[in-house]
Every structure is written in C-alpha cells, then in structure tokens.
C-alpha cells in the first residue's frame, strides 16, 4: 500500500478530490487559517500577547494520490500539512522570506493539525475489479501547541481549551444545523 510513511493503524490515507478539484474553501478562509482557535492563557515569553488568535504556524499544501493495494484514486489530491515554528503572527509572516521566524527561548511550540474533515473516496481498481470506497480523514486546519520545559516531549500543551475537543479534533456533530450557518462547510466537505 502506498504512502506507508504517512499511515498509521488508523489508515489515514489521503482521498482524491475528484469531485472537487479545487482546494476546499475552508482552507482558504482566514478565520481557520494560521491561527489557534479559542482562548486561553498565553505562554510567558518576551513577545507575550493577550490574544491567542495571534499565534500562527504555516499550513502547507502538497499533492499526491490515494492508494489502497492495487487501487488508486483517479486524480491526485492536495493535502494540508502543518509545518514550521509557532509564534506571534505579527512576527511570523506566511510569505516565506518576509521577515524572520520567531524562536521562543523558553517553551517549545509545535504546529499540529487542529481540525479534520472526513471524506468517502472512490478508488479505481485494475483488472475490472469493482471500484471500492474508503473513508479517510484530511487535515482541515493547523494550530500551535505549547510544550513547556517541565513536561515530557510527548506531552503537548494546548493554548486554550482545544484539548477538550473530541477525538481527532472533530467538533461534536450537530443533528440540525441551519443551512446558512454551515454553507461553507457543506460546500466543501467533499
């Protein structure tokens, strides 16, 4: 199976966006890009800011196919990858080469996936085998997490209340949300 380096036991292979070849709008929305959602106590450092939303890390995109055994998605997909160091957004421009990356002297900051979205993927198989479908998860946005010097490297501390979110960073699913309020989410879930 392809992309072994990116797969764990949850088999989070990246789906094809054949139905929607453009990058999903939610990934281009400034409200979800380059910020940590929700409030909380900011870390103590020389550039301390009262607004957690000012903390930023880079969200990169790259393209690849989904494979599952001999089956492969018809088109390559664009996946969001959380990368780079975290720091106050005003010192951490998205445009590479514009300013210096901010380095905290005390706590260690990590850019990690914040929200995921799920998608059913149609995979085409050789030899006349019937198309198969898989459900996979995509990173929808990134956020900064803080690791203090007093904690083990594996224990990442959230800026705010993100840790209380459900598994995989998904919000609890509504049964009857208004269409208007969720139009963007509806339009790009696949």
């Amino acid at each position: 199976q392809g992309w072994q380096a990116f797969k764990n036991d949850a088999t989070e292979i990246i789906p094809e966006l054949g139905e929607y070849p453009e990058p999903p709008p939610e990934l281009e929305n400034n409200k979800t890009m380059n910020r940590a959602e929700n409030g909380g106590r900011p870390p103590h450092h020389p550039f301390e800011t009262k607004d957690v939303s000012e903390y930023s890390c880079r969200e990169l995109h790259f393209t690849r196919y989904v494979t599952d055994g001999p089956c492969r998605s018809a088109k390559p997909v664009t996946e969001l990858v959380c990368s780079g160091q975290c720091g106050p957004a005003r010192l951490l421009p998205n445009a590479i080469g514009r300013g210096k990356w901010w380095r905290p002297s005390g706590p260690d900051f990590r850019c990690i996936p914040d929200r995921y979205r799920a998608q059913r993927v149609q995979l085409l198989c050789p030899g006349g085998e019937a198309p198969r479908a898989r459900k996979v998860r995509l990173v929808a946005s990134c956020k900064c997490k803080r690791l203090t010097r007093f904690h083990n490297q594996s224990e990442l501390k959230d800026f705010g209340t993100e840790a209380a979110r459900p598994q995989k960073g998904r919000k609890p699913r509504p049964r009857a949300r208004s269409a208007k309020a969720n139009q963007a989410e509806l339009e790009n879930a696949y």
Epitope: E19, Q119, A133, K135, Q167, L186
Partner: antibody, heavy 118, light 107 residues
Framework: QVQLQQPGAELVKPGASVKLSCKAS????????MHWVKQRPGQGLEWIGM????????NYNEKFKSKATLTVDKSSSTAYMQLSSLTSEDSAVYYC???????????WGQGTLVTVSA | SIVMTQTPKFLLVSAGDRVTITCKAS??????VAWYQQKPGQSPKLLIY???NRCTGVPDRFTGSGYGTDFTFTISTVQAEDLAVYFC?????????FGGGTKLEIK
C-alpha cells in the same frame, strides 16, 4: 434544516420495477454522497449503495448491483433508486441518507415502504 | 465485506439500569464506527460517530468507546424514552455494514 423527503409507500407487482425518490433540502445537494439503505420488517439495515450528486459517480454493495440503479437530478435536488425484477424479498422499507461530513449517516428520510404483491 | 457482530440481540432492563452493547468487527476498522438509535416506526438516528464522539443534542448518558475490532456502546442510566433498537455500523470501507441490532425493552 436538512430534510430528505420520501414517499410513504409503493405497491408493485412481482417482476415489475419501481423508482423511489428522495428530495433533499436545507443543504447543498451536490456536496454530499447520498446513500440508500434497506430494512426488511423487523430486521436489520443493509447498505445498498451511494451516489455523488456532483459527478454522478456511484458505488454499490455487490449484493444489490443487479437490483438497484442510483441516479440524481441536480436541478430538483432529488436522488432516485430504481429497483428492478421485484420479488417478495424486495419488500422492505428503503431509506435515503446523507453523510453531512462523512461521519456517519447523519440525516435520514422517513423511508418508503415497498410492498411486492400480486 | 466487513462483518459487524453485535451482542446481545435483546435487552430487558429497568429504568435507571446501566446497559452495555458490544460490536465486534471482522477486521480492524480503526475508530470508524457509528451507533444509531431506531425508535419504533421511525428512521434511524445517528448518536455516536468515530466510535466515541457524541452528536450534538444527544444526552451524555450515551457513550461509545473502542478501536480496531472491539467497540462498546453504553447507556449509563436507561430512561423510558430509550426504548429502541440500537445498531452499530462500520464506516471504514465499502460496503458499509451494520450490526444486527440490539432491541432494548424497558420493564
């Protein structure tokens, strides 16, 4: 509010075909897979297949591949399932359901009871 | 196809009791399991997704857990309105399959 509307019942003769409808409202119809699920009286749930309204691409449970044909009409935001060569085994309630984020079948129609009888 | 084996088939309990339903997948499905409640004469309703995430509006007495092949659905304190059939479903690969259902009856 997301709604999937299905007719209440269909009475059909053995050997005939029936085309079930599922009219969607309250969300962007073309953005989500639509699923069809069968439930025989007093029994469990069986997934028949799914269709993506945007592309028309579909995926079937092999068991129903020769029985069901899924289509959509984007202009009316309606999904259809045609069942052919009906027998008493096909008497069941048929539900349409959509994903709304692919986290499970979040929204279901009320179901159409298909009765196959001479 | 992935087979979901759900037990027990029937549960007769009193209001206030704790109820546990289990589902075993024939192969690993990660945490891609959903739980549904179907009340008499109604369509199924999604309660839990990703094995443990409760849908908005679903009372917190309903919980789910598990990963891989073994999954559990629990009602901590059964209430009269919980009379229904409960189904598990693997949401990992097609054909998406359901457990046989557990009929919960209240004494």
């Amino acid at each position: 509010q997301v709604q999937l509307q299905q007719p209440g019942a269909e009475l059909v003769k053995p050997g005939a075909s029936v085309k079930l409808s599922c009219k969607a409202s309250g969300y962007t119809f073309t953005s989500y897979w639509m699923h069809w699920v069968k439930q025989r009286p007093g029994q469990g749930l069986e997934w028949i297949g799914m269709i993506h309204p945007n592309s028309g691409s579909s995926n079937y449970n092999e068991k129903f591949k020769s029985k069901a044909t899924l289509t959509v009409d984007k202009s009316s935001s309606t999904a259809y399932m045609q069942l052919s060569s009906l027998t008493s085994e096909d008497s069941a309630v048929y539900y349409c359901a959509n994903d709304y984020d692919d986290e499970g079948f979040a929204y279901w129609g009320q179901g159409t009871l298909v009765t196959v009888s001479a | 196809s992935i087979v979901m084996t759900q037990t027990p088939k029937f549960l007769l309990v009193s209001a206030g009791d704790r109820v546990t339903i289990t589902c075993k997948a024939s192969q690993s499905v990660s945490n891609d399991v959903a739980w549904y409640q179907q009340k008499p004469g109604q369509s199924p309703k999604l309660l839990i997704y990703y094995a443990s995430n409760r849908c908005t509006g679903v009372p917190d007495r309903f919980t789910g857990s598990g990963y891989g092949t073994d999954f559990t659905f629990t009602i901590s304190t059964v209430q009269a309105e919980d009379l229904a059939v409960y189904f598990c479903q693997q949401d990992y690969s097609s054909p998406w399959t359901f457990g046989g259902g557990t009929k919960l009856e209240i004494k």
